[in-house]
Interface confidence: low
C-alpha cells in the first residue's frame, strides 16, 4: 500500500530526527513499551509490523553511527545529579515569586486581560504565544520551532511589554515590566541551562524505568498525529498529483483536523508549521512548552484570559516540569546509591 509506505517513511524520518538511540532501543526491546506505543499511535497491525521492521534497521544504523550513546547517557546523568539541587532551589524561588506577582495582579485589577500579546517571533501560526521552548530545541535544527535561539529574548520582551503596557497601567511599584520579564527569563534560563548541556541527548538521561509509560505513549501520540496529518493531506481535494510530503508546510486551507487530546501536541496546535520542525511535545520532552497565552483561534476561540490566571499558569507549568525533573533526580540518586 503506497499510502502506508509513505507514512512509514515519515515515521522513520521522525524517529531519526526526534528520538534518541536509547529511547528507540527502549521502545524496541521492551514488549510492554512497544505495545503501549502501538496503542497510543493507534496503528493498524500491518502498519505496526511494517514500522517495527523499519525501526529494526534504523536502530542498527543509529548504533553504528553513535557507538558511544550509552556512555553519553551516563555523562548527562552525572551532570544532572550534580547540578539539579541548585537549579531546583532557584526555580522554586522563581515559581514562588511568579505566584506572588499573580496574587498581586488579582488584588489590584481583577478584570484585566492580556491583549495583543502575540509576538511574531514567538507565535505558532494562528496566534498561540509559546513562551517556553525548551525541549523543542534539542530536537530541531534551524526550524521554526527552535525557540531558544538568538532573538528569543526579544520576542519575550515584546510579549511582556504587551502585558505590562497599556492594558495594565496600575502605577504600583511591585508590578513592573522588569519584574515579570526577569522572573520568566530567569526561569527560562534555569531550564535552558539543563537543555543546553543535554543538547540532543536530553532523552538519553530520561530513559528511566519510571518514565517508560509516558515516553512510549508520548512518541505514540506524535506518530498518531503525524499519521492523521498524512491521511488528511491525502484527502485534500486539490492536493497535487505528486502528493505533498509531510515535510512541507501544511497550510490552514489543507483541511487538517487533528483530534484533541489531554496533552495537546504541537502538531495539534499548529497549521502553519513544518512537521519536520515539530518536536515530540509529549512527556519525554521534560523541558516542555509552557504556554503563556492561549490566544489560539482554533483551540480557544476568542478566549481572553486574565493576566493573573496566565501568570499562575506559567508558574504551574514550571512547577510541573520541576516536579518531573525532581522525580528523575530521585530515581537517579537511588540508582547511584545501589
Amino acid at each position: 500500500d503506497p499510502e502506508s509506505s509513505i507514512f512509514i517513511e515519515d515515521a522513520i524520518k521522525y524517529f531519526k530526527e526526534k528520538v534518541s538511540t536509547q529511547n528507540l532501543l527502549l521502545l524496541l526491546t521492551d514488549n510492554e513499551a512497544w505495545n503501549g506505543f502501538v496503542a497510543a499511535a493507534e496503528l493498524p497491525r500491518n502498519e505496526a509490523d511494517e514500522l517495527r521492521k523499519a525501526l529494526d534497521n534504523l536502530a542498527r544504523q543509529m548504533i553504528m553511527k553513535d557507538k558511544n550513546w550509552h556512555d553519553k547517557g551516563q555523562q548527562y546523568r552525572n551532570w544532572f545529579l550534580k547540578e539539579f539541587p541548585r537549579l531546583k532551589s532557584e526555580l522554586e524561588d522563581n515559581i514562588r515569586r511568579l505566584r506572588a506577582l499573580a496574587d498581586g495582579v488579582q488584588k489590584v485589577h481583577k478584570g484585566t486581560t492580556i491583549a495583543n500579546v502575540v509576538s511574531g517571533s514567538l507565535s505558532i501560526s494562528s496566534g498561540i504565544l509559546t513562551l517556553v521552548g525548551m525541549g523543542l530545541a534539542p530536537f530541531t535544527e534551524g526550524g521554526s520551532l527552535v525557540l531558544l535561539e538568538p532573538g528569543m529574548e526579544l520576542g519575550i520582551t515584546a510579549a511582556l511589554t504587551g502585558i505590562t503596557s497599556s492594558t495594565m497601567d496600575y502605577g504600583k511599584k511591585w508590578w513592573t515590566q522588569a519584574q515579570a520579564h526577569d522572573l520568566v527569563i530567569k526561569s527560562l534560563d534555569k531550564l535552558k541551562e539543563v537543555r543546553e548541556f543535554l543538547g540532543e541527548n536530553i532523552s538519553n538521561f530520561l530513559s528511566l524505568a519510571g518514565n517508560t509509560y509516558q515516553l512510549t505513549r508520548g512518541i505514540g501520540k506524535d506518530i498518531r498525529a503525524l499519521r492523521r496529518a498524512r491521511a488528511n493531506l491525502q484527502s485534500v481535494p486539490h492536493a497535487s498529483a505528486s502528493r505533498p510530503r509531510v515535510t512541507e508546510p501544511i497550510s490552514a486551507e489543507s483541511g487538517e483536523q487533528v483530534e484533541r487530546v489531554n496533552e495537546p501536541s504541537i502538531l495539534e496546535m499548529s497549521r502553519g508549521v513544518k512537521l519536520t520542525d515539530v518536536a515530540p511535545v509529549s512527556f519525554f520532552l521534560v523541558l516542555d512548552v509552557v504556554y503563556l497565552v492561549y490566544e489560539s483561534k482554533h483551540l480557544h476561540e476568542g478566549a481572553k484570559s486574565e493576566t493573573a490566571e496566565e501568570l499562575k499558569k506559567v508558574a504551574q507549568e514550571l512547577e510541573e516540569k520541576l516536579n518531573i525533573l525532581n522525580n528523575n533526580y530521585k530515581i537517579l540518586q537511588a540508582d547511584q546509591e545501589l
Epitope: 532501543l25 527502549l26 524496541l28 526491546t29 521492551d30 510492554e32 513499551a33 529494526d56 536502530a59 542498527r60 548504533i63 550513546w69 550509552h70 556512555d71 551516563q74 528511566l208 524505568a209 517508560t212 540508582d335 545501589l338
Partner: antibody, heavy 121, light 111 residues
Framework: CQSLEESGGRLVTPGTPLTLTCTVS????????MGWVRQAPGKGLEWIGI?????STHYASWAKGRFTISKTSTTVDLKITSPTTEDTATYFC?????????????????WGQGTLVTVSS | AIEMTQTASPVSAAVGGTVTINCQAS??????LAWYQQKPGQRPKLLIY???TLESGVPSRFKGSGSGTEYTLTISDLECDDAATYYC?????????????FGGGTEVVVK
C-alpha cells in the same frame, strides 16, 4: 567493586523445583541485562536466557517453559521448574556489558563463579 | 532457530604461531557476535564483542572478524597462557528463536 554470586545449587531429585539466586553487588540492575548460562561437566557453555534492564526476558528455545528468570533490585533468580538429570551442570550468572541491548547484542563481561546443581534420584 | 557451529577441537599451534577459529551462525546475526576464553575450572572471559571490538584489557593479539553468518577469531603470537577453550556467542536475541547462543567450543593447544 562489582561482583556476582550464585547460590542455591544443591542435589535435588528429578521433578523438584529449584531456584538459583544471583546476588549482585555494586550493579544497578535497571541499567544492565543479566543472563544465565550453564555448563554440564566436561561439556560446553549452554545459554539459558536473559532478563533485560527493563525486565523483559528471552529464553533459548529449549529452555522455554523449563526455566523462569526474574529479578529484584539486587538479585536475579533462575527457577528450574521441573529438573531432570540432564539439568545437572554448573550454572553461571553473567552481567551484560554496559549498553548491551537486543540491537547491539548481549555480551557478558562479568561472571559469577557458578553454582553446581546435581539432579539425581 | 539460530544454531552456532564452531571449528572442531582441538586446534594446535606452536608458541609464537597463529591459530584461526571459525564460527558459523545458521542465519545472519548482524555482527552481534562475541568470543570468550575459558580455562578449566574457571569462569568464561569476554575477549571480543560486536564481531571485532576488543574488550578492554584484552591483548591486541586477539582479533575478531566477519559479518552475516561467518565469523573468525585469530590469535597471533601464541603464548602458553592462550591454551584454553574458545567459544563464540551470538548476541542477537529476539525475532528468531535460539537453540544455544554459544558455539560448541574449540580447544586450543599450544605446543
Amino acid at each position: 567493586c562489582q561482583s556476582l554470586e550464585e547460590s542455591g545449587g544443591r542435589l535435588v531429585t528429578p521433578g523438584t523445583p529449584l531456584t538459583l539466586t544471583c546476588t549482585v553487588s555494586g550493579i544497578d540492575l535497571s541499567s544492565y541485562a543479566m543472563g544465565w548460562v550453564r555448563q554440564a561437566p566436561g561439556k560446553g557453555l549452554e545459554w539459558i536466557g536473559i532478563i533485560s534492564s527493563s525486565g523483559s526476558t528471552h529464553y533459548a528455545s529449549w529452555a522455554k517453559g523449563r526455566f523462569t528468570i526474574s529479578k529484584t533490585s539486587t538479585t536475579v533468580d533462575l527457577k528450574i521448574t521441573s529438573p531432570t538429570t540432564e539439568d545437572t551442570a554448573t550454572y553461571f550468572c553473567a552481567r551484560a556489558r554496559a549498553g548491551s541491548t537486543y540491537y547491539t547484542g548481549y555480551y557478558f563481561n562479568l561472571w559469577g563463579q557458578g553454582t553446581l546443581v546435581t539432579v539425581s534420584s | 532457530a539460530i544454531e552456532m557451529t564452531q571449528t572442531a577441537s582441538p586446534v594446535s599451534a606452536a608458541v609464537g604461531g597463529t591459530v584461526t577459529i571459525n564460527c558459523q551462525a545458521s542465519e545472519s546475526i548482524y555482527s552481534n557476535l562475541a568470543w570468550y576464553q575459558q580455562k578449566p575450572g574457571q569462569r568464561p572471559k569476554l575477549l571480543i564483542y560486536g564481531a571485532s571490538t576488543l574488550e578492554s584489557g584484552v591483548p591486541s593479539r586477539f582479533k575478531g572478524s566477519g559479518s552475516g553468518t561467518e565469523y573468525t577469531l585469530t590469535i597471533s603470537d601464541l603464548e602458553c597462557d592462550d591454551a584454553a577453550t574458545y567459544y563464540c556467542q551470538s548476541g542477537y536475541y529476539g525475532i528468531s528463536a535460539i537453540n544455544n547462543a554459544f558455539g560448541g567450543g574449540t580447544e586450543v593447544v599450544v605446543k
